[in-house]
């Protein structure tokens, strides 16, 4: 689960053990801070909650790609 180191850094020490429905997720960010023991993905849900997920899991990678596509600006 994410642990706040300071106002700008959140570390994940435990990952959610179930797949979250794709449509519930609004955005994500990666934790790459040197303060954190391991890399993680933190999804933000539509109810404005944070969920820690394991970036090595396929569903997490797929959902990141899905969110990337959603946020890409259309090319003219």
């Amino acid at each position: 689960q994410p642990v706040g180191i300071n106002t700008s850094t959140t570390c994940c020490y435990r990952f959610i053990n179930k797949k979250i429905p794709k449509q519930r997720l609004e955005s994500y960010r990666r934790t790459t801070s040197s303060h954190c023991p391991r890399e993680a993905v933190i999804f933000k849900t539509k109810l404005d909650k944070e969920i820690c997920a394991d970036p090595t899991q396929k569903w997490v990678q797929d959902f990141m790609k899905h969110l990337d596509k959603k946020t890409q600006t259309p090319k003219l």
Partner: antibody, heavy 119, light 107 residues
């Protein structure tokens, strides 16, 4: 394994303020990704969600109770608390604390504490 | 707020029976629904999340289905230890809403 335990007075007088505390053991309350909730159950009735607090201090309260409730967190004691002001007999209930892991499912609950509002 | 209506409010069934409980939402909640079991004098226990997914450690005789506004909770072969009250809970919106509960008794 995270466990939750409610504590507080079992009897409160009308118009007074009810204060309950939930102690978290087996894990740190300041770990993010955990949302710490209060839920109550009137005698013989269903469940009513009261509100939650996040480790950052962010809260969300049920609008039906918002004017009377405060949920706070004390990371040094690994506790979070509920205060409910101006209580009436309608606030008589079993009060539960519960955790959700950001996924909106209450997967860990305290055993509940019965609070009676009576003079 | 979203209203959750469970039916029936109580039911009596025999060991081995297939038991079905329904939950209806006052608006579309996709599959954002959980089911809980509450035994007398105990706290509720999460059984099913996202309408149809079994929580870890929950026996496979429990199942859930549905989407939108209509949901079903099923116990395939009722066991004596299943005597409890069952609640649905939506999480499409805040505040979260629970159904009023279905009390299950053994004949």
């Amino acid at each position: 394994q995270v466990q939750l335990q409610e504590s507080g007075p079992g009897l409160v007088k009308p118009s007074q303020t009810l204060s309950l505390t939930c102690t978290v053991s087996g894990g740190s309350i300041s770990s993010g990704g955990n949302y710490w909730n209060w839920i109550r159950q009137h005698p013989g009735k269903g469940l009513e969600w009261i509100g939650y607090i996040y480790y950052s201090g962010n809260t969300y309260y049920n609008p039906s109770l918002k004017s009377r409730i405060t949920i706070s967190i004390d990371t040094s004691k690994n506790q979070f608390s509920l205060t409910l002001s101006s209580v009436t007999a309608a606030d008589t209930a079993v009060y539960y604390c519960a955790r959700d892991g950001g996924d909106d499912a209450f997967d860990i609950w305290g055993q509940g504490t019965m609070v009676t509002v009576s003079s | 707020d979203i209203q959750m209506t469970q039916s029936p409010s109580s039911l009596s069934a025999s060991v081995g029976d297939r038991v079905t409980i329904t939950c209806q939402a006052s608006q579309d909640i996709s599959n954002y629904l959980n089911w809980y079991q509450q035994k007398p004098g105990k706290a509720p226990k999460l059984l099913i999340y996202d309408a149809s997914n079994l929580e870890t450690g929950v026996p496979s005789r429990f199942s859930g289905s549905g989407s939108g506004t209509d949901f079903t909770f099923t116990i395939n072969s009722l066991q004596p230890e299943d005597i409890a009250t069952y609640y649905c809970q939506e999480y499409n919106n805040l505040p979260y809403s629970f159904g009023q509960g279905t009390k299950l008794e053994i004949k």
